[in-house]
């Protein structure tokens, strides 16, 4: 066990926030400004992410962790770790190569991002349209037409109230 430990890489003793400096007998040197090492035993530090332009800093870089970016107002994050910022559109629109465009008739988008999706087809479930769809909202499906035919009401009428003091005849 002692032999194994003596053969251990001396760099493994260098904590996060430092790098193992091969030029100086493998001493642990602190990461330079604007760089970090998130794990121990690293031989170099990593350059901090710069949140510039449409990106803004959500979390500053430290010697042990990278900066985290999000997007300026009017944009939203895409990709792992907010690798891209995409322009917001209004509800009822979708982003195309030519900018924000209104949803076509029969489609909707209830968010500031994403694409316009078709209204729900109520008839596929044997239901009727209760509330019409708009560019911003999906249709609301109601009960099926059969449920609305005369004598087929699903609502049970209340039992007639008895007058106090009268017994059934």
């Amino acid at each position: 066990f002692e032999r194994t430990r003596s053969l251990q890489d001396p760099c493994s003793n260098c904590p996060a926030g430092t790098f193992c400096d091969n030029n100086r007998n493998q001493i642990c040197s602190p990461c330079p400004p604007n760089s970090f090492s998130s794990a121990g035993g690293q031989r170099t530090c990593d350059i901090c992410r710069q949140c510039k332009g449409v990106f803004r800093t959500r979390k500053e870089c430290s010697s042990t962790s990278n900066a985290e970016c999000d997007c300026t107002p009017g944009f939203h994050c895409l990709g792992a770790g907010c690798s891209m910022c995409e322009q917001d559109c209004k509800q009822g629109q979708e982003l195309t190569k030519k900018g924000c465009k209104d949803c076509c008739f029969g489609t909707f988008n209830d968010q500031k991002r994403g694409i316009c999706r078709p209204w729900t087809n109520c008839s596929l479930d044997g239901k009727s349209v209760l509330v019409n769809g708009t560019k911003e909202r999906d249709v609301v499906c109601g009960p099926s037409p059969a449920d609305l035919s005369p004598g087929a009401s699903s609502v049970t009428p209340p039992a007639p109230a008895r007058e106090p003091g009268h017994s059934p005849q």
């Epitope: 330079p32 400004p33 170099t44 990593d46």
Partner: nanobody, 122 residues
């Protein structure tokens, strides 16, 4: 060959001032990220200050902000550290350092000088 020669250290009373100089050769201080690290007795290295992004931004350790100022003279290829309101805890060997960016994306630095001793004591 990269060479860094520090000077300007000495013994100073608390509250006093010193100006450290670093004469560089083998590279151009105006085109590189350069700065100062220090090592206090019995302690590890600590970054004190740096000029980054070819002069676009400066870095100061929290412990020296408002007291130390980093600058450079491109014509003399020299880096400076103006230290004022010195405290006992600033006692250390100060080294001039050059940040090194590796092809794989890693960052290290080298400091080849002997350093200059700064002692703050009454």
């Amino acid at each position: 060959e990269v060479q860094l020669l520090e000077s300007g250290g000495g013994l100073v009373q608390p509250g006093g001032s010193l100006r450290l100089s670093c004469a560089a050769s083998g590279f151009t201080v105006s085109a590189e990220d350069v700065g100062w690290v220090r090592q206090a007795p019995g302690k590890g290295l600590e970054w004190v200050s740096a000029i980054l992004d070819s002069g676009g931004s400066t870095y100061y350790a929290e412990s020296v902000k408002g007291r130390f100022t980093i600058s450079r003279d491109n014509a003399k290829n020299t880096l400076y550290l103006q230290m004022s309101s010195l405290r006992a805890e600033d006692t250390a060997v100060y080294y001039c350092a050059r940040v090194v960016y590796h092809a794989g994306g890693g960052v290290t630095y080298d400091y080849r000088g002997q350093g200059t001793q700064v002692t703050v004591s009454s």
